[in-house]
């Protein structure tokens, strides 16, 4: 059994609510800002996660070459809309009208706009790159072992399949990871990429999710390793519609 | 979903051993840790293991150790010199896989039933 369960927290997310109201006097949490009930069993979506965060008080919170059409969260924190699912709804408005549309992860993906703008669908996010800067250590990380202990970070941590876990790849300092998930691999109960995606580079900023204050100890043969920088490129199913203005910028 | 049960308990005079264990079904890679409530107290965290490295609290410094076995899924809390204020309900704990190990139960996701230990003198 679990501490949800007796001490009725929530042991994938701190950023809830939680009371013994459930069926049978279960524990049941739900999510800050929305006030959604979530599986504290597995991840939160990023999209209630990102809408927690907004409304909690400010003082708490071989290389690959990433394709011309990758996406950088460059425009950081906003309160997104969320639908019944926690997914991103696909349209995405501000508070003073202006709208665009975002990708499963929450990302921008044209420019921005009026109330007219219009959001098709929901683009899937398929393929995500994760770069990541080590800090310095006496020598270089053996690849199987990084590569090992990542796969398993991304399973047991994040409850992400393997079959996801696409790459690793090292070239001293550098790693990186690719998660790859179409929808069509996508099952029922199975972790979006997105959401591990997210949890991974809160864990590494010291900013853990997770109920438990220490935050994440992550070592390659009992050897720490400690990120100093971390770059995420998002791509799409569908290619992103930016104007060349924003591209030439 | 984790399930841990503690076996290895019983009654045993001052000054005696026991070998308590605590076998995890669906074992994850988790800081594994080992508290104790006697009657009427607070749940006391006794000692933890993670990645091969342990803690203990002062109070069974030098007398309990803790050591884990892979293989078999199982940690085991070898419990030496008891003395009767030992006497308590044992439980073993694992906190979510790849959380940095801590005494805070508050921090422990996954809890045994526990096993009952008395130390008469």
């Known amino acids: 059994h679990t501490a949800a369960q007796d001490n009725c927290t929530c042991p994938t997310n701190k950023m809830t609510v939680c009371s013994p109201d459930g069926p049978g006097g279960r524990c049941q949490c739900r999510a800050l800002g929305s006030g959604m009930a979530v599986d504290c069993s597995t991840l939160t979506s990023k999209c209630l996660l990102l809408k927690a965060r907004m409304s909690a008080p400010k003082n708490a919170r071989t290389l690959v070459r990433p394709s011309e059409h990758a996406l950088v969260d460059n425009d950081g924190l906003y309160d997104p809309d969320c639908d019944p699912e926690g997914r991103f709804k696909a349209r995405q408005c501000n508070q003073t009208s202006v709208c665009w549309c975002v990708n499963s992860v929450g990302v921008r993906r044209t420019d921005k706009g009026d109330l007219s703008l219009r959001c098709d669908e929901l683009v899937r996010t398929h393929h995500i790159l994760i770069d990541l800067r080590h800090r310095p250590t006496a020598g270089a990380f053996n690849h199987s072992d990084l590569d090992a202990e990542l796969r398993r970070l991304f399973r047991e941590r994040y409850r992400l399949h393997p079959k996801f876990v696409a790459a690793v790849h090292y070239e001293q300092p550098t790693i990186q990871i690719e998660l790859r998930q179409n929808t069509s691999q996508k099952a029922a109960g199975d972790v979006d990429i997105g959401d591990a995606a997210y949890y991974f580079e809160r864990d590494i900023k010291g900013e853990s999710l997770f109920q438990g204050r220490g935050g994440l100890d992550l070592r390659v043969r009992g050897e720490p390793l400690q990120v100093e920088r971390t770059l995420i490129y998002y791509l799409d199913e569908i290619p992103p519609k930016f104007s060349m203005k924003r591209l030439t910028a | 979903q984790v399930q841990l049960q503690e076996s290895g308990g019983g009654s045993v005079q001052a000054g005696g051993s026991l070998r308590l264990s605590c076998e995890a079904s669906g074992y994850t890679y988790s800081c594994m840790g080992w508290f104790r409530q006697a009657p009427g107290k607070e749940r006391e965290a006794i000692a933890n293991?993670?990645?091969?490295?342990?803690n203990y609290a002062d109070s069974v410094k030098g007398r309990f150790t803790v050591s884990q076995d892979n293989a078999r899924n199982t940690v085991y809390l070898q419990m030496n010199s008891l003395k009767p204020g030992d006497t308590a309900m044992y439980f073993c704990?694992?906190?979510?896989?790849?959380?940095?190990?801590?005494?805070?139960?508050?921090?422990?996701?996954?809890w045994g039933q526990g096993t009952q230990v008395t130390v008469s003198s």
């Open positions: 704990a694992a906190m979510w896989p790849y959380d940095r190990c801590g005494m805070d139960a508050r921090d422990y996701v996954y």
């Open positions: 293991i993670y990645g091969g490295r342990t």
